[in-house]
């Protein structure tokens, strides 16, 4: 359902964690949200920029029998072969009703930097 412009109640119930590892590491960042009605597409941001070629998967589970009931949506971003260019602040972004929401950030870093 559309939300009012002032009511910034975040739908995110799980935010990306932090990953710090050696070059070449494979890791996964995960976002979870709970929404009413049609589940939105989850986009990933790195340092405030939408990732155009994100290796992400999205799963959505209805919490009721009606399409307008709540859904749990989980998006996972896979980082393969960690490189310096992968480091930074990661967030999930959704467009929901009349509002844009971003998750709390997670950070990806390289060991030794």
């Amino acid at each position: 359902a559309p939300r009012g412009t002032q009511a910034e109640e975040s739908p995110f119930v799980g935010n990306p964690g932090n990953i710090t590892g050696a070059r070449g590491l494979t890791g996964t960042l995960r976002c979870q949200l709970q929404v009413q009605g049609e589940p939105p597409e989850v986009h990933w941001l790195r340092d405030g920029q939408i990732l155009e070629l994100a290796d992400s998967t999205q799963t959505q589970v209805p919490l009721g029998e009606d399409e307008q009931d709540d859904w749990i949506v989980v998006s996972q971003l896979r980082i393969t072969s960690l490189q310096l260019s992968d480091t930074g602040q990661y967030q999930c972004l959704v467009f929901l009703g009349h509002q844009t929401f971003v998750s709390q950030p997670g950070y990806v870093g390289l060991e030794g930097l």
Partner: antibody, heavy 118, light 112 residues
Framework: QVQLQQPGAELVKPGASVKLSCKAS????????INWVKQRPGQGLEWIGN????????NYNEKFKSKATLTVDKSSTTAYIQFSSLTSEDSAVYYC???????????WGQGTTLTVSS | DIVMSQSPSSLAVSAGEKVTMSCKSS????????????LAWYQQKPGQSPKLLIY???TRQSGVPDRFTGSGSGTDFTLTISSVQAEDLAVYYC????????FGGGTKLEIK
């Protein structure tokens, strides 16, 4: 409630520098780009540039690259725009605004009126 | 850089009339990843900060009267006010945020 607070006015002399502030509150400051917009009296809106508070990454309109410098202070959740070598052409209202990735809601400060005069 | 062109630069209409104003971009504003058109319309009344009316080319901001409608795709966009009211006296700007930001030059709406 999201707020962007800007001082109402600044008066400075030609040739001087000035640093205008934009105090953000009511949201995670590091998670949204802050944009700066110029409006000269009776004129249209001009985008100056933006800054991402978490990393201090910036983008500038080519026209303002040698005139304006964008910075942030994460500890006080404040964004700044500094102008150098001021002339009367820099007299304008300067707005800060929070970017929402092309969507909504859209938050603007009330604007700071900068007057450059001797 | 993306260039935004608005027309007309000004127009005067009587209350109750329908108004359309145009905004053209020098390139497509459709993001294939998000499937959104990064075009917004703002209203700026004298002495006030700009106010968002329309985003994603056609989505009306919450609280904006339904007499304001945004339309268009590709590079040609239109803001329509179906029945102009006295309080609509303002300058209207389009803005692209597909690649950084650029504003159009504005359309000044005057009421006869």
């Amino acid at each position: 409630q999201v707020q962007l607070q800007q001082p109402g006015a600044e008066l400075v002399k030609p040739g001087a520098s000035v640093k205008l502030s934009c105090k953000a509150s009511g949201y995670t400051f590091t998670s949204y780009w802050i944009n700066w917009v110029k409006q000269r009296p009776g004129q249209g809106l001009e985008w100056i540039g933006n800054i991402y508070p978490d990393s201090s990454s910036t983008n500038y309109n080519e026209k303002f690259k040698s005139k304006a410098t964008l910075t942030v202070d994460k500890s006080s959740t404040t964004a700044y725009i500094q102008f150098s070598s001021l002339t009367s052409e820099d007299s304008a209202v300067y707005y800060c605004t929070r970017d929402t990735y092309g969507g909504s809601p859209d938050y603007w400060g009330q604007g700071t009126t900068l007057t450059v005069s001797s | 850089d993306i260039v935004m062109s608005q027309s007309p630069s000004s127009l005067a209409v009587s209350a109750g009339e329908k108004v359309t104003m145009s905004c053209k971009s020098s390139q497509s504003l459709l993001n294939s990843r998000t499937r959104k058109i990064y075009l917004a319309w703002y209203q700026q009344k004298p002495g006030q900060s700009p106010k968002l009316l329309i985003y994603w080319a056609s989505t009306r901001q919450s609280g904006v009267p339904d007499r304001f409608t945004g339309s268009g795709s590709g590079t040609d966009f239109t803001l329509t006010i179906s029945s102009v009211q006295a309080e609509d006296l303002a300058v209207y700007y389009c803005k692209q945020s597909y690649n950084l930001w650029t504003f159009g030059g504005g359309t000044k709406l005057e009421i006869k």
